[in-house]
């Protein structure tokens, strides 16, 4: 989970505080509900998810509710408000649409049951940005070595549809990984800011898997990987070698 931990005691501190508060103040046990993740795909909405193991067991804690408070020196002293939407992000979740989301203020969220706080987190939206996967992966052949053993390809993709790249609201950096189909370990390329990259010196007789993920530059975490792109490089005889033209 990205962001700082806090407890209800945060409200007795500086109201703009996002720092950790003594975790000993919590009554949390491993069986009680806990936040598992908050995520914003595009800096304009976010959702938070939690575990709810206890409701599948014998102990009945009562209904789990999420409350949030936001902003700083003024509004922080107001009452906590309940989750605006328990449905849209799935089970055990709360969804904050664009009306409830701003990157310019801190948020604190808490889970309650029977009136007691069981978990609490504080964060800013940029810290929880995890973009959707890049889409439309494809590749083209750049060239083949003189020996016909290796080839270079160019891999291209598009930013996730919901990422506002044009206006610069999101600046994404991408990480491409590739491996031979029968290998287990992925080779990672250095992060780049463009939506295409050459991959050099692939073995011509092998099949490769390529995947790409992205993160907001300077903040947040990498999102999920794209669907795998399969690259099959046929044997040398199937290529027209550029040297044939000289």
């Amino acid at each position: 989970f990205s962001g700082s931990e806090a407890t209800a005691a945060i409200l007795s501190r500086a109201p703009w505080s996002l720092q950790s508060v003594n975790p000993g103040l919590k009554t949390n046990s491993s069986k009680e509900p806990k936040f598992t993740k908050c995520r914003s795909p595009e800096r304009e909405t976010f959702s938070c998810h939690w575990t709810d193991e206890v409701h599948h067991g014998t102990k009945n804690l009562g209904p789990i509710q999420l409350f949030y408070t936001r902003r700083n020196t003024q509004e922080w002293t107001q009452e906590w408000k309940e989750c605006p939407d328990y449905v849209s992000a799935g089970e055990n979740s709360c969804y904050f649409n664009s009306s409830f989301t701003s990157i310019w203020i801190p948020y604190c969220i808490k889970l309650t049951s029977n009136g007691g706080t069981v978990d609490e987190k504080c964060f800013s939206v940029d810290e929880i940005v995890q973009p959707d996967p890049p889409i439309a992966l494809n590749w083209t052949l750049l060239n083949v070595s003189l020996t016909g053993i290796h080839a270079d390809i160019q891999v291209r993709w598009e930013a996730p549809r919901n990422a506002d790249i044009q206006k610069g609201w999101m600046v994404l950096e991408y990480e491409l990984q590739y491996k031979e189909v029968n290998e287990t370990k992925w080779k990672m390329m250095d992060p780049i800011l463009t939506t295409s990259v050459p991959v050099y010196s692939l073995k011509v007789d092998k099949e490769y898997e390529v995947r790409v993920r992205s993160k907001q530059r300077n903040s947040g975490n990498y999102g999920e990987f794209s669907e795998v792109l399969y690259v099959t490089l046929p044997q040398m005889s199937q290529f027209t070698c550029e040297e044939d033209f000289y």
Partner: antibody, heavy 115, light 108 residues
């Protein structure tokens, strides 16, 4: 009581540099998100930059008009906010306000960029 | 960037009158993220109203705010002599934080 006191303003030539300081008191500075906002003479307000708390990784944000020229920073041990201004232009002439996330404001310090 | 346009540029009124100031955004702003400030000559701006309609600490209740979407309003029910000043709206919802150009409320 929140108090913010800016200093470091003055007259500087185009292309020159200046560092503004803001001494903060009356709140837990290390927990605070801090901003600089400026106001050109007889004009409106323009947000310049923001720096967040250590808990938020001291993340920084800038207006397009100052990106690459201005640097916001802080020293939590001294309860002080800074704005390093390089490659100054005449259009940077303004009163610069230090603010606690635009809720509480200092009295401002005047920066004049002129040859 | 969201541009905030304030109107009128100047409002000439007498003490005791009602003042209505307008702030229009180029695209929708959530009411949670719109503030109003008051600035007197030679002074720093002071937060008046936050989240469209909430009075900041120490602000008298003759000030009120309303609106949603792209249109927001600051109302001063009965102008007091100390209310003659410049008023700015401010959004921090989308894009970078922006301020309106200001409305000057002057004595008629």
């Amino acid at each position: 009581e929140v108090q913010l006191v800016e200093s470091g303003g003055g007259l500087v030539k185009p292309g020159g540099s200046l560092r503004l300081s803001c001494a903060a008191s009356g709140f837990t500075f290390s927990d605070a998100w801090m901003d600089w906002v400026r106001q050109a003479p007889g004009k409106g307000l323009e947000w310049v930059a923001e720096i967040r708390s250590k808990a938020n990784y001291h993340a920084t944000y800038y207006a397009e008009s100052v990106k690459g020229r201005f640097t916001i920073s802080r020293d939590d041990s001294k309860n002080t906010l800074y704005l390093q201004m390089n490659s100054l232009k005449t259009e940077d002439t303004a009163v610069y306000y230090c603010t606690l996330i635009r809720d509480y404001w200092g009295q401002g310090t005047l920066v004049t960029v002129s040859s | 960037e969201i541009v905030l346009t304030q109107s009128p540029g100047t409002l000439s009124l007498s003490p005791g009158e009602r003042a209505t100031l307008s702030c229009t955004a180029t695209s929708s702003v959530s009411s949670s993220y719109l503030n109003w400030y008051q600035q007197k000559p030679g002074q720093a701006p002071r937060l008046l109203i936050y989240s469209t309609s909430n009075l900041a600490s120490g602000i008298p209740d003759r000030f009120s705010g309303s609106g949603s979407g792209t249109d927001f309003t600051l109302t001063i029910s009965r102008l007091e002599p100390e209310d003659f000043a410049v008023y700015y709206c401010h959004q921090y919802h989308r894009s970078t934080p922006t301020f309106g150009g200001g409305t000057k409320v002057e004595i008629k």
